[in-house]
């Protein structure tokens, strides 16, 4: 019962998390104009991963997409990639976890298969959450760097004649949505991995007994009766999980440095 609850809760938490990651990716408020030094402004700028927007004091808002692909900063492209990978992995994870749910019966699917699927979806959720958190954090770091660069250059270049504040950008709502959503997906993934342990049929430990038949000597060992849970010495299952680990590594194999122009 506790296993079903853990699995179900993990699924729901991951579902909310992935919905949040999708929402964050689509949101326009990744960076918003800093109004600290200029609270009364005729226009308010905010930017997303896909377009920039201007909201006027009249309430009118206009947005324009980033129609170029090559002209965009490498960091922005990297963030886009991380968020999309997170969404794709999360979506696949959700699909797998639906079939893995203990409360759903599909044909004569064994508990061992459900355990494997639960673990797979759990790993996918964890990687998905990490991708989202990484993407949002990279963008946040980019904002912080640019913010302080703007602050340093605020009154320069005009001989101190014009005391005007350069437009600076600070954290938008999408960043917080992304962090929370990534965290939820991560937690959901961990819960699925925990549930997987409970789903695996417990192995029965029998003592090795030797039966001496006339003319033949055959020893029966309990290893052959081990359930294929992936926690025993079953090499087939080990390979499945190794494959999963490789996928995780491949997902994270991005260039370590992104030049921001």
């Amino acid at each position: 019962m506790a296993v079903t609850a853990c699995q179900g809760l993990g699924f729901v938490v991951s579902l909310i998390g992935i919905a949040g990651i999708i929402a964050a990716t689509c949101m326009d408020q990744w960076s918003t104009q800093d109004l600290y030094n200029n609270p009364v402004t005729a226009v308010f700028n905010y930017q997303g991963l896909w377009r920039s927007c201007v909201r006027e004091s009249s309430g009118f808002t206009e947005c324009r997409g980033y129609f170029t692909l090559l002209g965009l900063p490498a960091m922005l492209q990297a963030v886009r990639a991380l968020m999309i990978v997170g969404i794709v992995l999360g979506a696949i994870g959700l699909l797998v976890s639906i079939f893995a749910l203990k409360c759903i019966r599909i044909g004569s699917m064994e508990d061992s298969a459900k355990a494997n699927m639960t673990l797979t979806s759990g790993i996918m959720f964890i990687v998905s959450g990490l991708c989202a958190i990484a993407g949002v954090s990279v963008f946040a770091n980019m904002l912080v760097t640019n913010f302080w660069m703007s602050t340093a250059n605020m009154y320069t270049g005009m001989g101190g004649m014009v005391q005007t504040v350069q437009t600076r950008y600070t954290f938008g709502a999408a960043l917080f949505v992304g962090w929370v959503a990534g965290g939820l997906t991560l937690i959901g993934g961990v819960m699925m991995c925990i549930a997987c342990r409970g789903l695996a049929p417990e192995e029965t430990n029998y003592k090795a007994v030797s039966y001496h038949a006339s003319g033949h000597s055959v020893a029966y060992k309990p290893g052959g009766f081990k359930a294929s849970t992936g926690f025993g010495s079953n090499t087939k299952n080990k390979k499945i999980y190794d494959g999963g680990a490789r996928t995780e590594d491949e997902v994270q194999s991005y260039p370590s440095k992104h030049d921001y122009v």
């Epitope: 104009q33 402004t41 005729a42 226009v43 700028n45 920039s52 201007v54 006027e56 004091s57 009249s58 009118f60 206009e62 947005c63 324009r64 005009m158 014009v162 005007t164 504040v165 350069q166 437009t167």
Partner: antibody, heavy 119, light 111 residues
Framework: QEQLEESGGGLVKPGASLTLTCTAS?????????ISWVRQAPGKGLEWIAC???????TYYASWAKGRFTISKTSSTTVTLQMTSLTVADTATYFC????????????WGPGTLVTVSS | DVVMTQTPASVSEPVGGTVTIKCQAS??????LAWYQQKPGQPPKLLIY???TLASGVPSRFKGSGSGTEYTLTISGVQCADAATYYC?????????????FGGGTKVVVV
């Protein structure tokens, strides 16, 4: 005192190119403004050419100006208008104007610079 | 592009009278309209924006109204200083592709 000043006008031959510059003083284009170029032929009405939103360097042109005119923000105090393949019909006083938002209208204008296209 | 049609082309009014200038847009411009006053040898001066909001320093005898495609500028109690050419302009909306087209202008003569 916030001011705009146009420069780069003068006498040119048909087919020539010319770049007009709008220079800000007392404020900076690093802030968010809509800067437009407007022209007025002698004895005629006002004709809007192009606009740039300095916040993102978004640009927009009158349909007749596309291709021949290019508006751009070249520094935190200058916006330029590049004009190519000039004809006699382009003879006019060229103004640059600033709006605080697309909604607010152009509340700051330069005195204008005269461009004469003649052979 | 939006086409702004301004009427009449010229109007003559005695001091103290009322002048009404109409401006019609070829499509709805959602009250994104400005009115300007221009005197010979000078750049235009903003009078009204947002169809009805008076710009700072503009006398209250200037009044803007209208919505959709039909807009009006009314000058009540006309003074000699009001003799000028008046232009309506559709406000620039960059992303939606609405240009800042001007009307043909209305010359106001105060007699």
């Amino acid at each position: 005192q916030e001011q705009l000043e146009e420069s780069g006008g003068g006498l040119v031959k048909p087919g020539a190119s010319l770049t007009l510059t709008c220079t800000a003083s007392g404020f900076s284009f690093s802030n968010n403004y809509y800067i437009s170029w407007v022209r007025q032929a002698p004895g005629k009405g006002l004709e809007w050419i192009a606009c740039i939103y300095t916040g993102y360097s978004w640009t927009y042109y009158a349909s007749w100006a596309k291709g021949r005119f290019t508006i751009s923000k070249t520094s935190s105090t200058t916006v330029t208008l590049q004009m190519t393949s000039l004809t006699v019909a382009d003879t006019a006083t060229y103004f640059c104007a600033r709006a605080d938002s697309g909604y607010s209208g152009f509340n700051l204008w330069g005195p204008g610079t005269l461009v004469t296209v003649s052979s | 592009d939006v086409v702004m049609t301004q009427t009449p082309a010229s109007v003559s009014e005695p001091v103290g009278g009322t002048v009404t200038i109409k401006c019609q847009a070829s499509q709805s411009i959602d009250s994104r309209l400005a009115w300007y006053q221009q005197k010979p040898g000078q750049p235009p001066k903003l009078l009204i924006y947002g169809a009805s909001t008076l710009a700072s320093g503009v006398p209250s005898r200037f009044k803007g109204s209208g919505s959709g495609t039909e807009y009006t500028l009314t000058i009540s109690g006309v003074q000699c200083a009001d003799a000028a050419t008046y232009y309506c302009q559709c406000s620039v909306t960059i992303s939606t592709g609405v240009g800042g087209a001007f009307g043909g202008g209305t010359k106001v003569v105060v007699v």
